[in-house]
């Protein structure tokens, strides 16, 4: 499996070949109103998706997206 693995304040891309144990490409997007943003993309052995309501961004939120195809975590939103 190939995933994008990177950390940034916005969308980022950096493709790597994951370890054999990794079954998921994972994207965690954290938005805090005073603290800024963090996008973290990784290979993952397990992944539990969590989605947040559209209107929550201004009050601080975090979401996790999971997918299982090569470079499927290229975009911030599947």
């Amino acid at each position: 499996l190939r995933c994008h693995v990177c950390t940034s304040s916005s969308n980022c891309k950096h493709s790597v070949v994951c370890p054999a144990s990794s079954r998921f490409c994972k994207t965690t997007n954290t938005v805090e109103p005073l603290r800024g943003n963090l996008v973290k993309k990784d290979c993952a052995e397990s992944c539990t998706p969590s989605y947040t309501l559209q209107g929550q961004v201004s009050s601080g939120t975090s979401s996790t997206q999971c997918c299982q195809e090569d470079l499927c975590n290229e975009k911030l939103h599947n």
Epitope: S8, S9, P33, L34, R35, G36, L38, S58
Partner: antibody
């Protein structure tokens, strides 16, 4: 070029007011939270206040709460700090800073000096 | 008194490695990421490290960060004269609901 330029500092008597401004350029100002950080002579950095992109969230250090007011005008790409009831201990170099990456000030201005003295 | 604790000064000879420590508590470093800034004489602070150990773009890879529990450290390898500056650690504090800084560490290159 990404840039923050502070202005409005100066010498002021205790108890008086001052308004600092920060002009932003080179990035989409209304995408980011902005902050004021100060450094008193011979001291370390101290966070003063922060404001979210849409002014919906605002925070202050306990040392300035009730005296300072942060605001922003996204149409003018500008950040402000209204400082009332100034004290000698507010004497410092005041920086405005942009928050991009979580918990990190990735762009800083050169600072404007505020001196509170009679 | 700063919320985060740093040594006031450290020094090292050129090409050596120096480490600057930063001690906090469960409400800041223990729960949140650590950021490191460099302040060269007469200049504005500059972001070096964010999210504990990630190098900001354009920063030399001679700088590295690490964190364990409620403490963090900044290592500078292959020390150069231009590294002479003040270094500050910072973290968000959940109790104070804002960012907190260390008192700063002045690095002298001998």
């Amino acid at each position: 070029e990404v840039q923050l330029v502070e202005s409005g500092g100066g010498l002021v008597q205790p108890g008086r007011s001052l308004r600092l401004s920060c002009a932003a350029s080179g990035f989409t100002f209304d995408d980011y939270a902005m902050h004021w950080v100060r450094q008193a002579p011979g001291k370390g950095l101290e966070w003063v206040s922060g404001i979210s992109w849409n002014s919906g969230s605002i925070g202050y250090a306990d040392s300035v709460k009730g005296r300072f007011t942060i605001s922003r005008d996204n149409a003018k790409n500008s950040l402000y700090l209204q400082m009332n009831s100034l004290r000698a201990e507010d004497t410092a170099l005041y920086y405005c800073a942009k928050t991009g990456i979580l918990d990190a000030f990735d762009i800083w201005g050169q600072g404007t000096t505020v001196t509170v003295s009679s | 008194q700063s919320v985060l604790t740093q040594p006031p000064s450290v020094s090292g000879a050129p090409r050596q490695t120096v480490t600057i420590s930063c001690s906090g508590s469960s409400s800041n470093i223990g729960q949140n990421s650590v950021t490191w800034y460099q302040r060269l004489p007469g200049e504005a602070p500059k972001l070096l490290i964010y999210y504990d150990d990630l190098l900001h773009s354009g920063v030399s890879d001679r700088f590295s960060g690490s964190k364990s529990g409620t403490s963090a450290s900044l290592a500078i390898s292959g020390l150069q004269s231009e590294d002479e500056a003040e270094y500050y650690c910072a973290s968000w504090d959940d109790s104070l609901k804002g960012p907190v800084f260390g008192g700063g560490t002045k690095l002298t290159v001998l």
